[in-house]
């Protein structure tokens, strides 16, 4: 039950996070005009990863896309790439995790397969979240650097426009959305990895099997296992028989890859 809840919560948190990463990537307000030096400006500038916008006093808003690819700064390209990689990984992770959900039955899929898929999606969410956080942080660093370089005719690094002294840019709403969304995706991924450990195949109770020796009759009783939490290795669960006979249900217990996160 706890495993299902952890997995379900991890999925929901990651879903919200990835939706946030997509929203942040599409938002125009990655950087907004700093009004500290010019609070009376009637023209408000803000810029995104894909276009820059100007909102005029009349209420008219004009946005222009960055139609050049080669003319854009490498940093901006890197941020775009990180965000897109984050979205793609997150989307694949979501797709995988849907099939991995314990509450959803798909044919005769074994728990081991679901555990593998849960771990895979968890790792994808973690990488997706890290990509988003990295992308937003790189952009934020770029803004901070440019903020203090507000000399006349400064190259802004955003669409290659000439910057006049009075226009400086500060953090936009998209940065905060991106940081929060990346964090949520990361948390969701960790939760999926934790849930995966609980989904790892456990050793089941053994059927009582009687072996008739030629001389006298010896019955081997099944071992009484301690209750397992689902976390950690089951190698400590000692069997109370010492016969060499093995049932078809008994599997040798080695630490699996799901035991260590």
């Amino acid at each position: 039950m706890a495993v299902t809840a952890c997995q379900g919560l991890g999925f929901v948190v990651s879903l919200i996070g990835i939706a946030g990463i997509i929203a942040a990537t599409c938002m125009d307000q990655w950087s907004t005009q700093d009004l500290y030096n010019n609070p009376v400006t009637a023209v408000f500038n803000y810029q995104g990863l894909w276009r820059s916008c100007v909102r005029e006093s009349s209420g008219f808003t004009e946005c222009r896309g960055y139609f050049t690819l080669l003319g854009l700064p490498a940093m901006l390209q890197a941020v775009r790439a990180l965000m897109i990689v984050g979205i793609v990984l997150g989307a694949i992770g979501l797709l995988v995790s849907i099939f991995a959900l314990k509450c959803i039955r798909i044919g005769s899929m074994e728990d081991s397969a679901k555990a593998n898929m849960t771990l895979t999606s968890g790792i994808m969410f973690i990488v997706s979240g890290l990509c988003a956080i990295a992308g937003v942080s790189v952009f934020a660093n770029m803004l901070v650097t440019n903020f203090w370089m507000s000399t006349a005719n400064m190259y802004t690094g955003m669409g290659g426009m000439v910057q006049t002294v009075q226009t400086r840019y500060t953090f936009g709403a998209a940065l905060f959305v991106g940081w929060v969304a990346g964090g949520l995706t990361l948390i969701g991924g960790v939760m999926m990895c934790i849930a995966c450990r609980g989904l790892a195949p456990e050793e089941t109770n053994y059927k009582a099997v009687s072996y008739h020796a030629s001389g006298h009759s010896v019955a081997y009783k099944p071992g009484g296992f301690k209750a397992s939490t689902g976390f950690g290795s089951n190698t400590k669960n000692k069997k109370i028989y010492d016969g060499g006979a093995r049932t078809e249900d008994e599997v040798q217990s080695y630490p699996s890859k799901h035991d260590y996160v």
């Epitope: 005009q33 010019n38 009376v40 400006t41 009637a42 023209v43 500038n45 803000y46 810029q47 820059s52 916008c53 100007v54 005029e56 006093s57 009349s58 209420g59 008219f60 004009e62 222009r64 802004t156 426009m161 000439v162 910057q163 006049t164 009075q166 226009t167």
Partner: antibody, heavy 119, light 113 residues
Framework: QVQLVQSGAEVKKPGASVKVSCKAS????????MHWVRQAPGQGLEWMGM????????NYAQKFQGRVTMTRDTSTSTVYMELSSLRSEDTAVYYC????????????WGQGTTVTVSS | DIQMTQSPSSLSASVGDRVTMTCKSS????????????LTWYQQKPGKAPKLLIY???TRESGVPSRFSGSGSGTDFTLTISSLQPEDFATYYC?????????FGGGTKLEIK
């Protein structure tokens, strides 16, 4: 057809207040800022401030801060400009204007309201 | 506040003449975000409300004859009437549309010679 119809001429005594109205028609009243501009006899144009009919948010020129109040009534699509503590130098023609350029919508101005401040 | 200075304050010309008037602002009206100059030109005839001619320093308002053209960037702007018509005799105002308050220039009165 867009129309801005202003109230009639006013004669006021110094120290009094005047409230000029501007009734809009032919467009979505709440979508555009309304500006107030005045012109003293034989003088140039002077921007007083603006109001957004939807939110009621205003922006006044520092010169008129504390003396001017711009309000709106969305039910009648009317904006009002009230100027208090009138002085003789407030004698002017007061215009309301719906300013929205940068699109297919042009500028529209009211016909003007003459306010005379005289003792 | 941004100060707007127009010159000359009055100008005499004949029908068919090419006329140029200037407007200087105390601060740059160029917005780096879209590389547009937020300067507007108005025409006003006696007893009438102003009429928008040009916005963004050089963009003609719809319905305004092509003989009117605006140019300039930053702090220096020009309004040119290529061939004066009788209906063009009026007062012309430039206006800062970049920062509050939206200050107007003193105006240039265009009279018949």
């Amino acid at each position: 057809q867009v129309q801005l119809v202003q109230s009639g001429a006013e004669v006021k005594k110094p120290g009094a207040s005047v409230k000029v109205s501007c009734k809009a028609s032919g467009y979505t009243f709440t979508s555009y800022w309304m500006h107030w501009v005045r012109q003293a006899p034989g003088q140039g144009l002077e921007w007083m401030g603006m109001i957004h009919p939807n939110s009621g948010s205003t922006n006044y020129a520092q010169k008129f801060q504390g003396r001017v109040t711009m309000t709106r009534d969305t039910s009648t699509s009317t904006v009002y400009m009230e100027l208090s503590s009138l002085r003789s130098e407030d004698t002017a023609v007061y215009y309301c204007a719906r300013r929205y350029y940068g699109s297919i919508s042009p500028d529209y101005w009211g016909q003007g309201t003459t306010v005379t401040v005289s003792s | 506040d941004i100060q707007m200075t127009q010159s000359p304050s009055s100008l005499s010309a004949s029908v068919g003449d090419r006329v140029t008037m200037t407007c200087k602002s105390s601060q740059s009206l160029l917005n780096s975000g879209n590389q547009k100059n937020y300067l507007t030109w108005y025409q006003q005839k006696p007893g009438k409300a102003p009429k928008l001619l040009i916005y963004w320093a050089s963009t003609r308002e719809s319905g305004v004859p092509s003989r009117f053209s605006g140019s300039g960037s930053g702090t220096d702007f020009t309004l040119t009437i290529s061939s004066l018509q009788p209906e063009d005799f009026a007062t012309y105002y430039c206006q800062n549309d970049y920062s509050y308050p939206f200050t107007f220039g003193g105006g240039t009165k265009l009279e018949i010679k």
